[in-house]
Interface confidence: medium
């Protein structure tokens, strides 16, 4: 199923400044049926000292983030649940300078999830924080409907169908 | 290039299957397969896309879905086959490449295959 | 559904002169407008995309600008080859103008 309901909250500066960084994100349904609640709490726990931000093992460090690029394939929910798992969340590009960076580090010429996807409640491409894309800056090559999620390729965002397993990369 | 083939004059209802043969590349991930018509005499309406990539999703206008279908047959090859035809089907029928990021536009097109029903 | 308004339907000016065809979206596409240009028994020819970027081998006669929700095409030095039928595409698949005929007298 794909989330589209809920909302990421954004950590910014490495705080999570107000009451409501707690809400529940709501129920995610995986794949194999069940469920189970994402709390924001988790989503700030390691953003907590962003200028000084250390990096764990086996993660990229760029621009005073983390990255971690996957070398399995998932569908584009399984590939979100897996980066909240780890206090993480699916890639979001705030600009071309950190896809560049993203472009350098993909060894594989195949496409890779980011956390970028078509709402039906919003009805437009919302990353996985909550915030919209900025169409003036990225284009979302193919079309955008419902069960729609964004993967790139060669410094492009593809629109694909959720359920295609791809490589992801995580952030936090 | 791209060259399209399997036009023919057919009789209302009858189904048809058109083919777009790739030449000097073959299919891969990064851009769209599509076919798109024109009337005599009118414009270009857009019918469907494939992903060239390994999961192949297709895309299809609202009025096209149910009667067209977008397949890719071969690395080289894509077809589309046609149902139910009626007049308003008489076309010639374009098979076109989008690989652009900046925008929805196609950047090779075959020369066109006609449709008369 | 985004829709595109392609003005005027027809246009006829003399080799030399100038042709601006305007292109209005139903709601912004910010600058994601292809320009196409066909001639008759062809396939249309892509002359210009994101509003303002000439494809490889288009004259710099050829000008692409505008938006958001309006775009123009102008055409400069006209020749006698530039006499075609004139197609915008908007950031969608199936956004296509209604198409300008243009003559050159």
């Known amino acids: 199923l794909l989330v589209s309901q809920g909302v990421l909250l954004k950590c910014q500066k490495g705080s999570c400044s107000n009451a409501t960084q707690y809400e529940d994100t709501g129920d995610l349904k995986v794949n194999n049926g069940t469920r189970r609640n994402i709390s924001n709490k988790d989503l700030c726990a390691s953003r907590s000292a962003d200028q000084t931000v250390l990096c764990q093992s086996e993660w990229l460090k760029y621009q005073g983030k983390c990255y971690w690029f996957s070398n399995e394939m998932k569908s584009w929910s399984d590939s979100y649940v897996y980066c909240l798992e780890r206090k993480s969340h699916l890639l979001i590009i705030h600009d071309q300078l950190e896809m560049a960076f993203i472009q350098k580090n993909l060894r594989q010429l195949n496409y890779v999830w980011i956390g970028l996807n078509f709402t039906s409640l919003k009805m437009t491409w919302t990353w996985v924080d909550g915030s919209p894309i900025d169409s003036k800056i990225f284009f979302i090559k193919g079309p955008a409907k419902e069960n729609s999620c964004a993967a790139i390729k060669e410094s492009k965002i593809f629109s694909e169908t959720c359920s295609s397993v791809f490589k992801w990369i995580c952030q936090y | 290039s791209l060259e399209e083939s399997g036009g023919d004059l057919v009789k209302p209802g009858a189904s048809l299957t058109l083919t777009c043969t790739a030449s000097?590349?073959?299919?891969?991930?990064?851009?769209?397969m599509c076919w798109v018509r024109q009337a005599p005499g009118k414009g270009l309406e857009w019918i469907a896309c494939i992903y060239a990539g390994s999961s192949g999703s297709t895309h299809y206008a609202s009025w096209a879905k149910g009667r067209f279908t977008i397949s890719k047959t071969s690395s080289t090859t894509v077809t589309l086959q046609m149902t139910s035809l009626t007049a308003a089907d008489t076309a010639t029928h374009f098979c076109a490449r989008d690989d652009g990021n900046s925008g929805d536009y196609f950047k090779i097109w075959g020369p066109g295959t006609l449709v008369t029903v | 559904d985004i829709v595109m308004t392609q003005t005027p339907a027809s246009v006829e000016a003399a080799v030399g002169g100038t042709v601006t065809i305007k292109c209005q979206a139903s709601q912004s596409i910010y600058s994601w407008l292809a320009w196409y240009q066909q001639k008759p028994g062809q396939p249309p020819k892509l002359l210009i995309y994101k509003a303002s970027t000439l494809a490889s081998g288009v004259p710099s006669r050829f000008k692409g600008s505008g938006s958001g929700t309006d775009f123009t095409l102008t055409i400069s030095d006209l020749e006698c080859d530039d006499a075609a039928t004139y197609y915008c595409q908007g950031n969608s698949w199936g956004a296509f103008g209604g198409g300008t005929e243009v003559v050159v007298k």
């Open positions: 000097g590349f073959s299919f891969s991930s990064g851009y769209y």
